[in-house]
Interface confidence: medium
């Protein structure tokens, strides 16, 4: 399955929207910085696109979940958030279309399940952090910057796999 060109463009738009969503400077939130332990190795050890697609799907689904909560709606600009949802939704559709075409429909390798679990745990850490920080503006800014970084890393892996085909 070959993801459409628009998927690549959608990834860049998602990053642009995340950048536009910034409300305060990260420099004013230095005391709130946190290492969420993004499982980068889980994106680096998937050698076939068939293995990366479910992991990338999980990543985008979790971002969608994170930013579609009531607390998130209160934190961000509604227009930007709507555009953000649209881009994420389109990317989920692209990835799901690949799964339907037969990529990853065979029995899921344990390694892939472990990778999906690692992504879920990463987002659990982010959610817990937000709760502990009482969804403060600085906490959301730290999370926004973190999602930009991790999303960029994960989509870059996906692009590199495509370029090797």
């Amino acid at each position: 399955c070959d993801l459409p060109q628009t998927h690549s463009l959608g990834s860049r738009r998602t990053l642009m929207l995340l950048a536009q969503m910034r409300r305060i400077s990260l420099f004013s939130c230095l005391k709130d910085r946190h290492d969420f332990g993004f499982p980068q190795e889980e994106f680096g050890n998937q050698f076939q696109k068939a293995e990366t697609i479910p992991v990338l799907h999980e990543m985008i689904q979790q971002i969608f979940n994170l930013f579609s909560t009531k607390d998130s709606s209160a934190a961000w600009d509604e227009t930007l958030l709507d555009k953000f949802y649209t881009e994420l939704y389109q990317q989920l559709n692209d990835l799901e279309a690949c799964v339907i075409q037969g990529v990853g429909v065979t029995e899921t390798p344990l390694m892939k399940e472990d990778s999906i679990l690692a992504v879920r745990k990463y987002f659990q850490r982010i959610t817990l952090y937000l709760k502990e920080k009482k969804y403060s503006p600085c906490a959301w800014e730290v999370v926004r910057a973190e999602i930009m970084r991790s999303f960029s890393l994960s989509t870059n892996l996906q692009e590199s796999l495509r370029s090797k085909e």
Partner: antibody, heavy 119, light 108 residues
Framework: QVQLVQSGAEVKKPGASVKVSCKAS????????MHWVRQAPGQGLEWMGE????????IYAQKFQGRVTMTRDTSTSTVYMELSSLRSEDTAVYYC????????????WGQGTLVTVSS | EIVLTQSPATLSLSPGERATLSCSAG???????LYWYQQKPGQAPRLLIY???NLASGIPARFSGSGSGTDFTLTISSLEPEDFAVYYC?????????FGQGTKLEIK
């Protein structure tokens, strides 16, 4: 500061190929897609395609598919655009332009390379 | 392919006057991905406006952009001698990315 320096002017015969280079400096080369845009004499701008220098992934405009090849050399922070089966209507100034997000999109351009196709 | 049509093709005005340049898209363009560039003879294009209405770095406040959907406008409130050039609208809302054919702003 960000700089994109392109190779010099070329004169080619119809049917030949041309390879234009664009050397980037002043930023992390692998962090931004690089685009190629051309402009025929007295005409408007035309997007040809783009390359991700991080891993070489390319996306070409349908019009140039099969005739254009974009490559990169990360060791020298240089991208290349090769156009084959040249015809007279390919006579143009070819620009490289750096992609980015928001205000960074096409904020930096090479100086342009004139390619003349003539028999 | 989204076709961008600019009007007028040529605009003749005097310094100090107000310039209004139009860009009409063949199909809807997300305003976040509509940009304007200025080009002078022998030079590469220069970014003026990004995301329909945002001024690029170093661009004077006399330049402004507006619009949505299929109709976009670049306005120069009071023309300076250095503003006479060709102006292009550009979209990266969908592939292939396209430019308008340009509007030449000339001194009357």
């Amino acid at each position: 500061q960000v700089q994109l320096v392109q190779s010099g002017a070329e004169v080619k015969k119809p049917g030949a190929s041309v390879k234009v280079s664009c050397k980037a400096s002043g930023y992390t080369f692998t962090n931004y897609w690089m685009h190629w845009v051309r402009q025929a004499p007295g005409q408007g701008l035309e997007w040809m395609g783009e390359i991700n220098p991080s891993h070489g992934r390319t996306i070409y405009a349908q019009k140039f598919q099969g005739r254009v090849t974009m490559t990169r050399d990360t060791s020298t922070s240089t991208v290349y655009m090769e156009l084959s089966s040249l015809r007279s209507e390919d006579t143009a100034v070819y620009y490289c332009a750096r992609g980015g997000l928001g205000p960074a999109w096409f904020a930096y351009w090479g100086q342009g390379t004139l390619v003349t196709v003539s028999s | 392919e989204i076709v961008l049509t600019q009007s007028p093709a040529t605009l003749s005005l005097s310094p100090g006057e107000r310039a209004t340049l139009s860009c009409s898209a063949g199909s809807s363009v997300d305003s976040s991905y509509l940009y304007w560039y200025q080009q002078k003879p022998g030079q590469a294009p220069r970014l003026l406006i990004y995301s329909t209405s945002n001024l690029a770095s170093g661009i004077p406040a006399r330049f402004s952009g507006s619009g949505s959907g299929t109709d976009f406008t670049l306005t120069i409130s009071s023309l300076e001698p250095e503003d006479f050039a060709v102006y292009y609208c550009h979209q990266w809302s969908s592939y292939p990315f396209t430019f308008g054919q340009g509007t030449k702003l000339e001194i009357k």
